[in-house]
């Protein structure tokens, strides 16, 4: 009988009593074989995490700084359960920390040294540790101790709990840096008055601070915030401009044989039976002898955590970074005005040796990172180990949900001006051979199907999106007979005409045979009925194009698009008969990076971009023999995105509209997990 | 398509040195990187040291200050002087030129290098 205890740790003795009561409470509602729960108790929070990383507890709820503990090595603890506040339709499990100034002040983020600062109180998230954190590299050597740091960089302070005898400037705008409401500037409330007064040029707060304090829209219309790319906002868009965006409180239990969905079970029934307005004899988020025992008072219930998601991610890469500055306290030694390398991530070995010969050549401007799928190289680029790749449409959509930018576009024709002028796309087209002559864009059913891969433009988003708008269900391993569509799961029947060996089989990386373009359109040739692939696809691979043995044979004339009327065309009439118009591919990093990306990305292609005209004696960056390692094989280069530099304005709304009717049948786990921080 | 047949492996202390050799079967005047890899048992092959047809190198930040790529095109041959060896870099040693190995892994047989007491 597997174990369906979940040891929760307390830690006082207040906690142990509650948790006791928890205990004997859900007994009483739960059956014999449901969760239950057991009590540890612990001196501390650390106490807790070390002992639930040995096995000896299950779950404790920590703060954001108490995860981040959890999450280093040796704990290596993950979340598994967020509390949220406000109401169950609009449910908050974060807060962002926000640098609020007032409206006609004219500087930026990069700006304020030198500028009169208020904060919440020394040592607290939004107030101290986060913006300090994120200015920790430029704050005046010796940063140690940090607090004179501070005092150093700023003209003058109102950091309430300082030590106001040794570091009077921090107390500079309060007198005495009282650490309770006594100070009429602590805490958040008190910060904003700081800024209000005009004893202070910026005040960091939390985003709803200033809507708690200023109730009227005009009156907020007086500030702005602060961006971390050194622009300003209104203090409305605090998702897209703010200094870091914080779990409020999390549960988190082990990374292996964590039990977190008997977690999320015991929590989702105590919810049920004993969340807010629930039950009078015992109340989950209410504390008779404390204050937030084992959960926090304010909670309204618990959402749980999606499984793709470590603490890295759940946190964010902005709190990561300023928290640990300020534990580490290492900077990089290079001015900040340079750019350090941009680290490439690289798709399974075959891209890691092109990556590799890219870095080898651009002499210390490029290093390589290797992740074995999309979604994991995405992930990478967020947390911060590696900075950009070249992402499908399908793929920039999943990295601008996940809080990426794109910075430059794969242009695919030749013109004069290629690097200025980004196109309007390329065409998502069904191919089928000619000798099956019956074979129609409304018979498909019960055939064999070719896929670039699950989640990319042409070879899914597009064609799956059309059929589900058809077929109204995601089934769509039961609509086709069998297929191959890299990245579906493995006992699909959209991976059985896959030609990848072992664990390599229907894997979304160039492992798979049968993946990306060239790969779908071999599929067609060897096994399928219909490939969805790009319009130069045939031209490509055929006519002695592609010298691999399965293509070099190849004739243009033998396979014909399915168009959406019913009817067939020549493979060369893709403009009048495609699926629809699908973004380039394109280039996408963190934000923080965009500019460096741009300008070494740039440099690169002067070097090794088309212009190289012998690749053989010479590194091209845009050629892999039909492979379209790194960057499409056809790229002649990459172009300025101008105004179209965010997610929703470069895909355009048509296909970003297409794409999120397709999520219902998304099995995209890392979507699921950036819409859980960004609904 | 060039071959290419790597030499000069060997067993060796902890602090001591070995000169790996990689020989083509023709010109390498033309190639515009050479490179050598390696492969412990059990792990990912990784790259150890390049060098471009100019000549500008690039190393793993674990071999930095002891291991030097150089390339001699009249003698159509790539070396790695390594130095100060370490246990931790015992493996086989492949070189490649990169011309098949983006779509295929065309890799020679390699060279072992052991160091151990």
């Known amino acids: 009988v597997p174990d369906k205890t979940v040891r929760w740790c307390a830690v006082s003795e207040h906690e142990a009593t509650k948790c006791q009561s928890f205990r004997d409470h859900m007994k009483s509602v739960i059956p014999s074989d449901g969760p239950s729960v057991a009590c540890v108790k612990k001196a501390s929070y650390l106490d807790c995490i070390r002992a639930i990383a040995a096995n000896e507890a299950d779950a404790v709820t920590l703060d954001a700084g108490l995860v981040y503990d959890a999450y280093l090595a040796p704990n290596n603890l993950k979340p598994v359960v967020a509390e949220f506040y406000g109401s169950k339709e609009d449910p908050q499990t974060f807060y962002y920390a926000v640098a609020v100034v007032k409206k006609d002040s004219g500087f930026q983020m990069n700006q304020l040294r030198g500028k009169k600062s208020c904060h919440t109180g020394l040592g607290r998230s939004a107030g101290w540790n986060i913006p300090i954190g994120l200015l920790y590299c430029d704050l005046p050597e010796p940063r140690k101790p940090l607090e004179k740091a501070v005092a150093n960089f700023f003209s003058g302070s109102c950091a309430p709990c300082a030590d106001g005898t040794d570091f009077p400037q921090l107390c500079q705008l309060c007198p005495g840096c009282g650490c309770s409401t006594l100070n009429q500037y602590f805490g958040y409330s008190g910060a904003f008055k700081c800024l209000k007064d005009g004893a202070g040029d910026v005040a960091f707060v939390k985003h709803s601070t200033i809507f708690e304090n200023l109730a009227n829209k005009a009156d907020r219309d007086q500030y702005e915030l602060l961006c971390l790319d050194n622009t300003r906002k209104p203090v409305d868009e605090y998702k897209d401009c703010h200094l870091a965006q914080v779990p409020s409180h999390t549960v988190v239990a082990r990374s292996m044989g964590g039990k977190e969905d008997l977690i999320w079970e015991l929590l989702n029934q105590a919810q049920e039976h004993f969340g807010k307005d629930k039950s009078k004899e015992f109340q989950l988020f209410s504390s008779p002898h404390g204050k937030d025992l084992l959960f926090k008072d304010s909670a309204h219930g618990f959402l749980k955590v999606p499984p793709r998601m470590d603490a890295k991610m759940y946190l964010g890469y902005e709190y990561v970074t300023a928290i640990r500055n300020l534990r580490e306290g290492t900077c990089p030694e290079a001015p900040t005005d340079e750019c350090k390398p941009v680290k490439w991530c690289a798709l399974s070995h075959h891209e890691r040796l092109k990556c590799d010969e890219w870095s080898v050549n651009s002499v210390g401007k490029i290093e390589c990172v290797s992740a074995e799928t999309t979604e994991d190289c995405i992930a990478k680029i967020m947390n911060g180990e590696a900075d950009a790749m070249s992402l499908d449409g399908g793929f920039v959509y999943i990295a601008g949900k996940c809080g990426l930018v794109p910075v430059l576009a794969e242009n695919y024709n030749k013109s004069d001006n290629c690097e200025d002028t980004p196109e309007a796309g390329y065409f998502a087209i069904a191919v089928v051979k000619k000798s099956a002559s019956d074979l129609t864009w409304d018979n498909l059913k019960g055939k064999k199907s070719c896929h670039t891969a699950v989640g990319r433009t042409a070879g899914w988003n597009i064609p799956m999106g059309l059929l589900y708008n058809k077929i109204n269900h995601c089934r769509f391993d039961e609509f086709f007979s069998e297929g191959c569509a890299p990245g579906s799961k493995k006992d699909s029947s959209l991976c059985k005409l896959c030609m990848g060996s072992g664990l390599n089989l229907c894997e979304p990386n160039n492992k798979e045979g049968y993946y990306g373009y060239t790969g779908a359109f071999r599929c067609l040739v060897e096994k399928g009925d219909v490939a969805f692939v790009k319009h130069q696809t045939v031209p490509q691979n055929t006519g002695g194009k592609n010298p691999d043995p399965w293509a070099k044979n190849l004739n243009e004339k033998d396979y014909e698009l399915l168009c959406l009327d019913g009817t067939r065309k020549p493979v060369e009439e893709y403009a009048n008969c495609h699926l629809a118009r699908a973004p380039n591919h394109a280039v996408v990093t963190r934000k923080d990076k965009e500019a460096c990306v741009h300008k070494i990305l740039r440099q690169q292609q002067h070097l090794f971009g088309s212009n190289v005209t012998d690749c053989s004696g010479n590194f091209c960056l845009f050629r892999s023999e039909t492979k379209d390692l790194l960057f499409r094989d056809d790229t002649v280069c990459l172009a300025k995105l101008h105004d179209r530099n965010t997610y929703e304005k470069y895909l355009g709304e048509e296909y970003v509209k297409a794409v999120g009717n397709l999520r219902k049948c998304s099995t995209s786990s890392l979507l699921e997990a950036c819409t859980f921080r960004r609904p | 398509q060039v071959k290419l047949e790597e030499s000069g492996g060997g067993l060796v202390q902890p602090g001591g040195s070995l000169r790996l050799s990689c020989a083509a079967s023709?010109?390498?005047?033309?190639?515009?990187?050479m490179a050598w890899y390696r492969q412990a048992p059990g792990k990912q092959r990784e790259l150890v040291a390049g060098i471009t047809r100019g000549g500008s190198t690039k190393y793993a930040d674990s071999v930095k200050g002891r291991f030097t790529i150089s390339r001699d095109n009249a003698k159509n041959t790539v070396y790695l002087q390594m130095h100060s060896l370490k246990p931790e870099d015992t493996a086989v040693y492949y070189c490649?030129?990169?011309?098949?190995?983006?779509?295929?892994?065309?890799w020679g047989q390699g060279t072992q290098v052991t160091v151990s007491s």
């Open positions: 490649t030129d990169y011309s098949r190995t983006y779509y295929e892994d065309h």
């Open positions: 023709g010109s390498i005047v033309s190639i515009a990187t």
